[in-house]
């Protein structure tokens, strides 16, 4: 049985040419995490992050995704077709798959914040 | 030029245990991940696991776990896999295998090592 | 653990002819897929990644398209030293797997 969750940085906004971290973190399991996924709205992976071998970073997103905080990413450079969803799968044993959803807005404005609070989808 | 060495091929009996290595060269040896990929006689190809030189972090296919241990030593720039328990299963040549900086493609591979368990 | 099916163990081409090879995958992959090429005798050798982007060095000839669950391996033109094994592999969820191999055969 599946008990975990994920939670996600939620929807957040960024300024265009700024970066941004996308975080996802899992709880109320013990199940190990063997593997995260990071994928774009297209359904096209940025990033491959395995418990022991380390990142993999795809690329098409070389030059803008480094790896981390943590199992985590971040985005930089961003531009206004970064806008859309962002998900996180974590694969974990022996539970299975879990999939978190994040929201990316990126603004023209200077004003834009870039927030920062966990939900839980 | 990056190259991957394999130890030559063995002839062991059931039941006894082999470690096969795979020195390497001409790169910073604890950069990049080393795959272990078994192919059995006329068949496909087996991920058995990988391991992280820098810290020794390894990760298997669970139907290895058990039979095979990765290890390294860096001082040598050598990685190796240990068998155990050899039955006529494990007979097949087995390959190290080095991934890309960051990315998990095969990209340099040794000669491979033919393993044989006979009686 | 995700399996990779080549429908087509063996596949008979000519010189010149166009080819392609397909690898389905038992659950999504996304974009983690790469293909190899094993001639007689050799190691693998990786020709596509990602599962679009060509090796280093690796003629042009060869490329490889696909996202989901369904991967092509296409050579433009077959030339005679592209007799062997092509394998696919995913990487998205460990066990990392390959398909079954296809062999080209030249006519």
């Known amino acids: 049985m599946m008990t975990g969750t994920i939670e996600t940085t939620g929807n957040i906004s960024a300024k265009k040419g700024g970066s941004v971290i996308l975080q996802c973190h899992l709880s109320s399991t013990m199940a190990q995490v063997t593997q995260v996924n990071w994928e774009q709205h297209d359904h096209s992976l940025l990033a491959i992050r395995n418990a022991e071998l380390g990142w993999h970073i795809y690329p098409a997103f070389k030059d803008r995704v480094a790896p981390g905080p943590g199992l985590g990413l971040t985005l930089q450079s961003l531009t206004m077709n970064d806008t859309g969803e962002y998900f996180c799968t974590y694969h974990t044993y022996p539970d299975g798959t879990y999939r978190g959803r994040i929201f990316l807005e990126v603004l023209e404005s200077s004003v834009a914040e870039h927030s920062a609070r966990f939900q839980i989808p | 030029e990056v190259q991957l060495q394999q130890s030559g091929p063995e002839l062991v009996k059931p039941g006894a245990s082999v470690k096969i290595s795979c020195k390497t060269s001409?790169?910073?040896?604890?950069?990049?991940?080393m795959h272990w990929v078994k192919q059995s006689h006329g068949k496909s190809l087996e991920w058995i696991g990988g391991i992280n030189p820098n810290n020794g972090g390894t990760s298997y296919n669970q139907k290895f776990k058990g039979k095979a241990t990765l290890t390294v030593d860096k001082s040598s720039s050598t990685a190796y896999m240990e068998l155990r328990s050899l039955t006529s299963e494990d007979s097949a040549v087995y390959y190290c295998a080095r991934s890309g900086h960051m990315d998990y493609g095969y990209v340099y591979w040794g000669q491979g090592t033919t393993l044989t368990v006979s009686s | 653990d995700i399996v990779m099916t080549q429908s087509h163990k063996f596949m008979s081409t000519s010189v010149g002819d166009r080819v392609s090879i397909t690898c389905k995958a038992s659950?999504?992959?996304?974009?983690?897929v790469a293909w190899y090429q094993q001639k007689p005798g050799q190691s693998p050798k990786l020709l596509i990644y990602s599962p679009s982007y060509r090796y280093t060095g690796v003629p042009d000839r060869f490329t490889g398209s696909g996202s989901g669950t369904d991967f092509t391996f296409t050579i433009s033109s077959v030339q005679a030293e592209d007799l062997a094994v092509y394998y696919c592999?995913?990487?998205?969820?460990?066990?990392?797997?390959f398909g079954g191999g296809t062999k080209l055969e030249i006519k």
């Open positions: 592999q995913q990487h998205y969820s460990t066990p990392w797997t």
């Open positions: 659950q999504y992959v996304s974009t983690a």
């Open positions: 001409g790169y910073t040896f604890t950069e990049y991940t």
